[in-house]
Interface confidence: medium
């Protein structure tokens, strides 16, 4: 279950620096498709975008507030921190963090939001916010089996690929013939690439995936690779060489 939770002081004094923490769970900030944004809403007013950060550490800031804002990710990959300097009473607002669904190249929309935290700026007493940190991550290993196999024309061939952690359906299969560029067969675990014969099919989700060739043809003798696209760095399986029997 995806959750985002904002924490920070409920009250800051004018000229002070505000530090807000967004603690996320149910997804990883190292996931290639994700980002986190901060948005605020003064009482009774519209939403205002402040800043965002993506898994590759790409950042962007509101033009009008750029000089006052800093956004960063905690190395634990579970927290995004926003600091805002030189606070003023007009900065009193509910501050939200939200997840950005980012499809690699084209940043898109906010699909999950935190509940928001109201920050008041006045010369009254101060408050404090907290936030912990979680564990780090590691590269996803893709284990293909078998590494080689002999088969005959007409055979049904099944190749498996196991991910070391859940990658949802972010898996593609490629065919590579000697001296040639890899050719994509399957994307999103089970979607057939346009122009690829229907004897190829893919299935699976989470950690277990299968490429099936229902009836092998002579041109199918090649090496097949799986590739995970869930988290940076993207990683390939070690390959399965399908050779002619005898």
């Amino acid at each position: 279950q995806v959750t985002l939770k904002e924490s920070g002081p409920v009250l800051v004094k004018p000229t002070e620096t505000l530090t807000l923490t967004c603690t996320v769970s149910g997804f990883s900030l190292s996931n290639a498709r994700m980002g986190v944004t901060w948005i605020r809403q003064p009482p009774g007013k519209a939403l205002e975008w402040l800043a965002h950060i993506f898994s590759n550490d790409e950042k962007s800031y509101s033009t009008s507030l750029k000089s006052r804002l800093t956004i960063s990710k905690d190395t634990s990959k579970t927290q995004v921190v926003l600091t805002m300097t030189n606070m003023d009473p007009v900065d009193t607002a509910t501050y939200y963090c939200a997840r950005i669904r980012d499809y690699y190249d084209i940043s898109s929309y906010y699909d999950y939001w935190g509940q928001g935290t109201l920050v008041s700026v006045s010369s009254g007493g101060g408050g404090s916010g907290g936030g912990g940190s979680g564990g780090g991550g590691s590269d996803i290993q893709m284990t293909q089996s078998p590494s080689a196999m002999s088969a005959s024309v007409g055979d049904r061939v099944t190749i498996t690929c196991r991910a070391s952690q859940d990658i949802s359906n972010y898996l593609a299969w490629f065919q590579q013939k000697p001296g040639k560029v890899p050719k994509r067969l399957i994307y999103a675990a089970s979607s057939l690439q346009s122009g690829v014969p229907s004897r190829f099919s893919g299935s699976g989700s989470g950690t277990e995936f299968t490429l099936t060739i229902s009836s092998l043809l002579p041109e199918d003798f090649a090496t097949y690779y799986c590739l995970q696209l869930n988290s940076f760095p993207f990683t390939f399986g070690g390959g399965t060489k399908v050779e002619i029997n005898g």
Epitope: W49, Y104, D105, I106, Y109, F174, R184
Partner: antibody, heavy 119, light 111 residues
Framework: EVQLQQSGPELVKTGTSVKISCKAS????????IHWVKQSHGRSLDWIGS????????TYNQKFKGKVTFTVDTSSSTAYMQFNSLTSEDSAVYYC????????????WGQGTLVTVSA | DIVLTQSPASLAVSLGQRATISCRAS??????????LHWYQQKPGQPPTLLIY???NLESGIPARFSGSGSRTDFTLTINSVEADDVATYYC?????????FGGGTKLEIK
């Protein structure tokens, strides 16, 4: 038609650097990252990283960080990958790739650039 | 910055009637064949909820009475057959160009 045209083979000496290119054509480049992949002889593939034509934002596989540098020249629709301090381990075919419009990467590939590092 | 102008600022409709909210961008929010314009619903005291992404795609779990249309600079959110539960403020948002921006909001009330 989407095309990724890579520069020709390179024979370089150990300790030197090499810069290979990937020229994109047939589509509006700003919407897409270029991804780079390494394939050592007879081995599997390694994703090196990616760079955005839109704003030059890069993502590197930690394994290659400090070893490679990505750049883009939007005026010529060309992405570059520079390899520094080359060793025999860097001898490989390097591919550039681009996602398809289904939001998955590597629907399109360059033809590959063979880099041979010799003493 | 891209300015998003929503109209009307507030809207009162009868239950079962259709509500139409407009969002006009100061420049095109289309790129690569997509419109990077999204719609959110916000009820008092709650964070916004995504309704429609990329102009016309209904977010999972959102009732089919909500629909979005438009391209380039002119977009519309339509609620067919308004229900009492739809009383909220609706915002459009663009993510085509940094900095991302929101419209000023449209408050929907029941007549």
């Amino acid at each position: 038609e989407v095309q990724l045209q890579q520069s020709g083979p390179e024979l370089v000496k150990t300790g030197t650097s090499v810069k290979i290119s990937c020229k994109a054509s047939g589509y509006s480049i700003t919407g897409y990252y270029i991804h780079w992949v390494k394939q050592s002889h007879g081995r599997s593939l390694d994703w090196i990283g990616s760079i955005s034509f839109y704003n030059g934002a890069t993502t590197y596989n930690q394994k290659f960080k400090g070893k490679v540098t990505f750049t883009v020249d939007t005026s010529s629709s060309t992405a570059y990958m520079q390899f520094n301090s080359l060793t025999s381990e860097d001898s490989a075919v390097y591919y550039c790739g681009r996602r398809g419009d289904d939001y998955d990467v590597f629907a399109y590939w360059g033809q590959g650039t063979l880099v041979t590092v010799s003493a | 910055d891209i300015v998003l102008t929503q109209s009307p600022a507030s809207l009162a409709v009868s239950l079962g009637q259709r509500a139409t909210i407009s969002c006009r961008a100061s420049e095109s929010v289309d790129s690569y064949g997509y419109s990077f314009l999204h719609w959110y619903q916000q009820k008092p005291g709650q964070p916004p909820t995504l309704l429609i992404y990329r102009a016309s795609n209904l977010e999972s779990g959102i009732p089919a009475r909500f629909s979005g249309s438009g391209s380039r600079t002119d977009f519309t959110l339509t609620i067919n057959s308004v229900e009492a539960d739809d009383v909220a403020t609706y915002y459009c948002q663009q993510s085509n160009e940094d900095p991302w921006t929101f419209g000023g909001g449209t408050k929907l009330e029941i007549k």
